[in-house]
């Protein structure tokens, strides 16, 4: 049977004067030699060697300082061994309790706590909760922390209180006003032993958040300005406003609005976000002949809603604005400012020279009729394609359009027309758009098998080749160009297969050079920018079908009409 006792030891103290702090004995000791052994944390597990046992009498001594925060109690396994090293008792677990000493101050979880609270908040509103811990024995006075506010900056009336036990910081008043004081700095102490023991301090930085509790107020009681008729203005007037709320926030940012007089939407007010000024813009031109003076009223509010503490006091304050309209000689303008012309279908892009598009005249603003004493010139005129009559404003082509023209956008070319008032020298500008015939990019070329044919057998094979096989959209129709003269048909075209045909003379032909104009159409009936002119030489041949002598050039004969079709 074990006989045992253990005294508690106090941390951070020399407990050796109380040794042995524990004693174990076995009643087997009466009749045999017993050796005592101990093990466990503080003995053969770190921290090593704190407790030692006298193997002969079972006295357990403490050898060094212990720390309750490291080891609140030591569980010592005790064994009683006989001479053979066998246990004579079941191992005993002996507990040595370590008594707490107030050796740890409270520790705040942060050195500076940051909090914020809206101005005008009700008293007792929660601002923040401070957190501190104490490593001494839990649920003991040594670890019981009491909080208190040591100081407040700016000093004066106390604005906050702290819960002694929970560390909750709350408002003491409902009169926090950011416009007066925008932040507070508190020093708070936490002391253990419920306020009388070891203490630590922390800082609290409390930001007072802005609410929209100040109305924007226009600095002037009325405004006036002058503007010439028929002009727009991006900044006719600036309205200044005073708002005490936090700058550059929605609580400060002014929103200007019309309360009356702008039903025609001539004016707009934009807020300059840097200065908070209202910029009055004229966005629709005013006509002196219709109105010589304009009166309207404006008011201002904030981008943010007003705070519930002041919203009931808000009244729309209308401020009058007077605008004088100044009469000016109005001059000329193009109405409409642009005009579109279309080139008739069937007119080829290489036959545009001299083609008249129409006229585009300026209007006299005072009379509303076509302007007189005006000289017309073209401004921008890409490629020099067009010309305008300086008096009549008639516009026509002076150049054909090249397939590779870079200034054709969406099958349209554009140019600028300037009307110069010869009385004042003032210029008005209009734009013309010309829709031009489309080029068929997929037109094939017609190739002759040979250039020379004999009078004895005047025929030659034609074949069609596309430039881009991937864009081939056949079948194509090839025909002789129709002639205005009612002449007998001289040539005929006969299909041979899907890609070739035979061009034959229908009557006796004399030696010479012949131009045969051919028209190619695709399956969408799109005209190509041809006719393509096929040049043939007809000559007297030898028995090997070779020309005997060079043929003098002669005017081309182009008669009749025939057609053939390639493809399926």
């Amino acid at each position: 049977e074990w006989v045992k006792f253990a005294k508690p030891c106090r941390e951070r103290e020399d407990n050796s004067r109380r040794n042995p702090i524990a004693k174990i004995t076995s009643d087997f000791q009466k009749n045999q030699k017993i050796t005592y052994r101990i093990s466990g944390v503080g003995i053969d597990q770190p921290p090593f060697g704190i407790f030692v046992v006298d193997p002969n009498n079972g006295d357990i001594n403490i050898t060094a300082i212990v720390d309750r925060e490291e080891t609140p109690s030591f569980l010592i396994t005790c064994r009683a061994l006989n001479a053979l090293g066998q246990d004579v008792e079941r191992p005993l677990i002996l507990t040595v309790k370590i008594l707490d000493v107030n050796d740890n101050p409270p520790i705040f979880s942060q050195t500076i706590f940051k909090g914020e609270i809206e101005e005008n908040s009700a008293s007792n509103s929660l601002v923040m909760i401070l957190n501190a811990t104490d490593a001494d024995e839990p649920n003991h006075m040594n670890s019981k922390i009491a909080f208190k506010i040591v100081s407040q900056e700016p000093a004066g009336m106390s604005m906050f209180l702290i819960s002694r036990n929970t560390g909750e910081v709350r408002t003491l008043t409902s009169s926090l006003d950011r416009e007066q004081i925008s932040s507070y700095h508190l020093v708070v102490s936490g002391a253990d032993n419920d306020g009388t023991g070891l203490s630590t301090q922390c800082e609290c930085s409390i930001k007072i958040k802005d609410v929209n509790d100040n109305f924007p107020v226009l600095r002037e009681s009325q405004y006036s300005a002058r503007i010439e008729e028929n002009t727009l203005n991006a900044e006719l007037l600036r309205f200044q406003v005073t708002d005490w709320d936090e700058e550059y926030t929605d609580n400060w940012l002014a929103v200007y609005f019309f309360t009356s007089g702008n039903e025609g939407n001539w004016f707009e007010i934009e807020t300059d976000p840097r200065t908070n000024e209202g910029i009055l813009k004229v966005v629709k031109a005013l006509d002196y002949e219709q109105v010589q003076s304009m009166q309207f009223s404006i008011a201002v509010r904030n981008k943010a809603e007003f705070h519930q503490s002041v919203i009931s006091q808000y009244r729309v304050q209308s401020t009058p604005v007077t605008i004088q309209v100044i009469d000016v000689r109005e001059g000329i303008s193009f109405r409409p400012p642009s005009k579109t012309f279309t080139v008739q279908r069937g007119v080829s892009t290489n036959k545009l020279v001299g083609y008249i598009l129409g006229t585009y005249q300026a209007t006299d603003e005072d009379t509303g009729k076509a302007a007189s004493s005006v000289r017309y010139v073209l401004g921008r005129n890409d490629g020099g394609l067009l010309v305008i009559d300086s008096k009549t404003a008639q516009i026509k082509f002076v150049k054909n359009i090249d397939r590779d023209s870079t200034f054709i956008v969406n099958k349209t070319i554009s140019a600028e027309v300037l009307a110069i008032d010869e009385n004042t020298g003032k210029t008005s500008t209009g734009t013309i758009y010309v829709e031009v015939p489309s080029f068929n990019e997929n037109c094939p070329s017609v190739v002759l098998e040979k250039k020379d044919i004999c009078t004895s057998s005047p025929s030659v094979t034609l074949s069609v080749r596309t430039l881009d096989r991937g864009k081939y959209t056949g079948p194509y129709t090839v025909s002789l160009e129709e002639q205005p003269l009612k002449l007998p048909v001289m040539w005929t075209i006969t299909t041979l297969n899907a890609t070739s045909a035979l061009l034959q003379a229908q009557q006796q032909v004399s030696p010479g050079v012949y131009n045969v104009p051919v028209i190619v159409k695709d399956n969408q009936d799109g005209l190509c920018d041809t006719p393509e002119s096929l040049t043939l030489t007809v000559c007297q041949c030898d028995d090997r079908s070779m020309c005997r002598a060079p043929i003098p050039s002669r005017e081309p004969n182009t008669y009749g009409e025939s057609s053939w079709r390639l493809g399926p």
């Epitope: 050796s16 770190p46 060697g49 704190i50 030692v52 050898t63 060094a64 300082i65 720390d67």
Partner: antibody, heavy 127, light 110 residues
């Protein structure tokens, strides 16, 4: 369980400063231990450099004291070693260790030992 | 200079008993506890003996130690090949701080 890990910039030039950090993971550096630096030149024995307690108290090897600074960073749970004016003789594997250092009561000796070690990091001093 | 003196090397065959000595002065071994560390090749040291003659939990009882006056010794009985390592004694010196012995290389001969 608690682990220690040494880290540093690698080779140091003669007359330069050797800087090492020991990260403590799985436990708090504010526990009641002495956080220690020990070094071992290649093929030689162990040499105690010094130790620090979490409150900043230190014990330093008198022969190195003028060149050694040991500091503790509680917020990052680590402690550091700085050794200035180094020479080739400072080339060694540097270990950080957790030490127990308790003054014995009357009639009892002082406890001083290391129960937990880092893996060690080799620092070479050469130009 | 070293304050704790150890033999640079000792050797023995498997099963044999070997001892490693550590001698010093009254300022460390004489008045403070001696600790022994084992350092296996390529690893950090590990505590083998605390408070002169006590074994930490997990250390085999083949390892024993003693202290007498200003000297201490470590004995390893029933030598095994895995005992091949460097062994260091250490103690706190009231004037110099922590001191280690120069270390002893134990070779297990096959």
């Amino acid at each position: 369980q608690v682990q220690l890990q040494e880290s540093g910039p690698g080779p140091v030039k003669p007359s330069g400063t050797l800087s090492l950090t020991c990260g403590v993971s799985g436990g708090s550096i504010s526990s009641n231990h002495w956080w220690t630096w020990v070094r071992q030149p290649p093929g030689k024995g162990l040499e105690w450099i010094g130790e620090i307690y979490h409150n900043g108290s230190t014990f330093l090897n008198p022969s190195l004291k003028s060149r050694v600074t040991i500091s503790v960073d509680k917020s990052n749970n680590q402690f550091s070693l700085k050794l200035t004016s180094v020479t080739a003789a400072d080339t060694a594997v540097y270990y950080c260790a957790r030490g127990w250092h308790r003054t014995g009561f009357r009639g009892y000796p002082s406890h001083w030992y290391f129960d937990l070690w880092g893996r060690g990091t080799l620092v070479s001093v050469s130009s | 200079e070293l304050v704790l003196t150890q033999p640079p090397s000792v050797s023995g065959t498997p099963g044999q008993r070997v001892t490693i000595s550590c001698s010093g002065s009254s300022s460390h071994i004489g008045s403070n506890y001696v600790y022994w560390y084992q350092q296996l090749p390529g690893t950090a040291p590990k505590i083998l003996i605390y408070s002169n003659d006590q074994r930490p939990a997990g250390v085999p009882d083949r390892f024993s130690a003693s202290k007498s006056g200003t000297s201490a010794s470590l004995a390893i009985s029933g030598l095994r090949s895995e005992d091949e390592a460097d062994y260091y004694c250490a103690a706190w010196d009231d004037g110099q701080g922590g001191v280690f012995g120069g270390g002893t290389k134990l070779t297990v001969l096959q």
